[in-house]
Amino acid sequence: ESGYAQNGDLEDAELDDYSFSCYSQLEVNGSQHSLTCAFEDPDVNTTNLEFEICGALVEVKCLNFRKLQEIYFIETKKFLLIGKSNICVKVGEKSLTCKKIDLTTIVKPEAPFDLSVIYREGANDFVVTFNTSHLQKKYVKVLMHDVAYRQEKDENKWTHVNLSSTKLTLLQRKLQPAAMYEIKVRSIPDHYFKGFWSEWSPSYYFRTPEINNSSGEMD
């Protein structure tokens, strides 16, 4: 059984795989940063297991994570964001496994929002726009965005477009007429920070016009 022995014998705990992954979110709540960690193995018995971060902190040596169901979480202004911190899984005072991590290399941006698509009849195109909270941030301002769209009936045939701006034009002739499309967007740090893709934005759905038979163009 996963987990450590209740009688204080740590042998069982040492046999378990306590590998974990973390991501940071900078200025996620005003000037506060967050750090989220979770075990790779969803079946790890997390009873009595704690996470702690030490080093590269302001005014304190170490900070303890709060446990929220299966994830471990810190929200604080105390990340120096310079150099490496040591993140450890602990049981009592004993460290089971640790990782040295620079928090600026595991940044996960916030998901883009307000995604919308406007059809321009005269231009025969669709203007895709979305917003990101990162435009207002001090640190993670430069992002690469991944816009993905598909015809709703094509379950797994997503077309991806990478862009650094928050506006994209899709040409009408590249899309099927009279079809329903789903579109969504996510972001990843680009320049100065490294990390992971954000969650996807909520999807937006739009319909392409029908073909006008006389001209061969879409209505």
């Epitope: 964001l81 310079i82 620079d102 920070f193």
Partner: nanobody, 118 residues
Framework: EVQLVESGGGLVQAGGSLRLSCESS????????MGWFRQAPGKEREFLAA????????HYSDSVQGRFTISRDNAKNTVYLQMNSLKSEDTGRYYC???????????WGQGTLVTVSS
């Protein structure tokens, strides 16, 4: 074997400026934090400024905030300290350090001497 070499020190008038450089031969330079410290005669070494691996994040001590600027050029494996409005109390040996790992700087240079005359 020499891994961090500081340069740019010298004698300068109060109110003047100097730019210190620190060249690293450490292979992980572009992913390491860098810092500048100074040791005044008869005093302990004190932290002045630090910069993250990409240059996006900097941190300064209160004593130099607004007067000193730390920057880096990862293509040249070099970190800089631009020092303006120098005061006599800025006199000392200036050291650069590399790889801030769990509150310990792993590598140190030999230092360069700065003298500010009033």
């Amino acid at each position: 074997e020499v891994q961090l070499v500081e340069s740019g020190g010298g004698l300068v008038q109060a109110g003047g400026s100097l730019r210190l450089s620190c060249e690293s031969s450490i292979s992980t330079f572009s992913s390491d934090a860098m810092g500048w410290f100074r040791q005044a005669p008869g005093k302990e070494r004190e932290f002045l400024a630090a910069i993250g691996w990409s240059g996006a994040v900097t941190h300064y001590s209160d004593s130099v905030q607004g007067r000193f600027t730390i920057s880096r050029d990862n293509a040249k494996n070099t970190v800089y300290l631009q020092m303006n409005s120098l005061k006599s109390e800025d006199t000392g040996r200036y050291y650069c350090a590399e790889d801030y790992d769990t509150d310990v700087w792993q590598y140190w240079g030999q230092g360069t001497l700065v003298t500010v005359s009033s």
